[in-house]
Amino acid sequence: QSGPLPKPSLQALPSSLVPLEKPVTLRCQGPPGVDLYRLEKLSSSRYQDQAVLFIPAMKRSLAGRYRCSYQNGSLWSLPSDQLELVATGVFAKPSLSAQPGPAVSSGGDVTLQCQTRYGFDQFALYKEGDPAPYKNPERWYRASFPIITVTAAHSGTYRCYSFSSRDPYLWSAPSDPLELVVTGTSVTPSRLPTEPPSPVAEFSEATAELTVSFTNEVFTTETSRSITASPKESDSPAGPARQYYTKGN
C-alpha cells in the first residue's frame, strides 16, 4: 500500500467531559490486525503504545488534547482527530436561568443566561439527551453562537458550564439543571451549524446569553459556546436554577 494508512478514531467513554476523580477510558480504534498503537497527550511528552488508556480518577493534569495513530509494518497511519478531554468540577458551578421564565409558548422568545461570579470568559451550554457528540470544538470557544430553525424541540433540560480561555480544558461544575418547557405544536428538530460565524458579543459582567426564538424562520442569535452532548455527570445536586439578582443587602 502506498501513502499513509487511514486515520483511526479516538473516543472517550463514557464522555469527554469528566468530573474530577471520576473514571474515563480513552479508546483508539483502527482496522483489524494493527501491529502497534500510539496514544499521546499533545503539548506534553506523555504517550503510550497501547490502544486503551484507562484513567481511574480524573485529574487536572490529565485534561487536554489527545490523539492516536497506529503502525502496520513500517507504515504509520495518519493521526486521529484530536480529542479534547475536559475536567469538570474544577471550579464552582455557574447559575443558569431563563428570562422571562422557563415556560414559553411556541412562537415566543426565551433567553437563557449562564452567570458566574468569577472572571471566566467562556461558557458551554448543553441540552440533555442530544445524541450527537460535539465536533470541531475550537470553533465553539466563542461568546456567540447562532441557533437555526429553533422549534418546540428545544424543550428539555439544560445545563451550562463556565471556564477560562487560558485553561480551556478545566471547567466548572455544571449549573443546576434548567427545565425549559415549550407549549404548542412540535416541528422539525433544531440543528446547530458545525461552523458558526463568530460575531463580537457584548457582555454584562460575566454573563452568557442564548436567545431562542420559537418560530419557523431562520433566527440567528448571540450565545455562548453551545454544543450538543449528553454528559453523564452529577457534580451538583439537582434543584431549581439559582437566580442572580442585583447586588444588595
Epitope: K93, R117, G119, F120, D176, S204, S236, G239, K247
Partner: antibody, heavy 119, light 113 residues
Framework: QVQLQQPGAELVKPGASVKLSCKAS????????MQWVKERPGQGLEWIGE????????NYNQKFKGKATLTVDTSSSTACMQLSSLTSEDSAVYYC????????????WGQGTTLTVSS | DIVMTQSPSSLAMSVGQKVTMSCKSS????????????LAWYQQKPGQSPKLLVY???TRESGVPDRFIGSGSGTDFTLTISSVQAEDLADYFC?????????FGAGTKLELK
C-alpha cells in the same frame, strides 16, 4: 444591617477536631455564598473555600481539602467549618465572610475566631 | 494558583499626603469579554476584620470615601489614597477574584508619621 457573629476564641488539643460557627443576620442567608478565610501572623490571608447555603454546594481550595469541611444550617442561618487532625499550623484567626452576589469578593466579614492548637 | 505581590510592605505618611500602593498578579486578571479586571482591595484596621474597598479594580464599594481610588489593568494595579486621614492607618490587601482559589497579597501596612 448585615452581621456575621463568630465566637472570639477556641482552644483545642493537637489531633482533635473543632467546629467553628458563623451566625448570619440582616440579609437572606440562602441568597449569598459564605466564604471562609484563614489569617496567620506573617502569612497573610488564605482562602479556604465557600459554600452556597441554598443547596450546600461547596467549593474548596485544594490546599484545605481534607482539612476543612463546610456546612450550613439554614434554619438558624448559621455556617460552620469543621477543622480536623489539628496541628500547630492550624493555629490562626478564621474569618467567615459573605460572598458578594455577583462577584467573588467578600463584602461583609465576621470578627474572626482565634483558634489555638496547644497541648 | 495566581500569586499576588504587593509593594511596599509598609509606608509611613503624614495626614493630607497622597499614598500609592502597588499590587501585581502572576496572571492577567482582565476578562476579555467584559473588559473588567477581577481585582479587589481590602482595608484591615488594627484588631478588626477586613473591609471591602474596591472591586473590579476601580469600582468603589458603597460607603467607601472617594479618596480611595483603584486603578490598573492586566497584571499591574494601584490603590491610591488621595489625601490620607488618620483613620486610614491600616493594612491594605489586594485579592484576585478572577478564579479559585481566591488569593490575596501579603499586604501593605500604612503607618502615620
Amino acid at each position: 444591617q448585615v452581621q456575621l457573629q463568630q465566637p472570639g476564641a477556641e482552644l483545642v488539643k493537637p489531633g482533635a477536631s473543632v467546629k467553628l460557627s458563623c451566625k448570619a443576620s440582616g440579609y437572606t442567608f440562602t441568597s449569598y455564598w459564605m466564604q471562609w478565610v484563614k489569617e496567620r501572623p506573617g502569612q497573610g490571608l488564605e482562602w479556604i473555600g465557600e459554600i452556597d447555603p441554598s443547596d450546600s454546594y461547596t467549593n474548596y481550595n485544594q490546599k484545605f481539602k481534607g482539612k476543612a469541611t463546610l456546612t450550613v444550617d439554614t434554619s438558624s442561618s448559621t455556617a460552620c467549618m469543621q477543622l480536623s487532625s489539628l496541628t500547630s499550623e492550624d493555629s490562626a484567626v478564621y474569618y467567615c465572610a459573605r460572598g458578594a452576589i455577583t462577584t467573588a469578593t467578600l463584602d461583609y466579614w465576621g470578627q474572626g475566631t482565634t483558634l489555638t492548637v496547644s497541648s | 494558583d495566581i500569586v499576588m505581590t504587593q509593594s511596599p510592605s509598609s509606608l509611613a505618611m503624614s495626614v493630607g499626603q497622597k499614598v500609592t500602593m502597588s499590587c501585581k498578579s502572576s496572571q492577567s486578571l482582565l476578562n476579555s469579554n467584559n473588559q473588567k479586571n477581577y481585582l479587589a482591595w481590602y482595608q484591615q484596621k488594627p484588631g478588626q476584620s477586613p473591609k471591602l474597598l474596591v472591586y473590579f479594580a476601580s469600582t468603589r464599594e458603597s460607603g467607601v470615601p472617594d479618596r480611595f481610588i483603584g486603578s490598573g489593568s492586566g497584571t499591574d494595579f494601584t490603590l491610591t489614597i488621595s489625601s490620607v486621614q488618620a483613620e486610614d492607618l491600616a493594612d491594605y490587601f489586594c485579592q484576585q477574584h478572577y478564579i479559585t482559589p481566591l488569593t490575596f497579597g501579603a499586604g501593605t501596612k500604612l503607618e502615620l508619621k
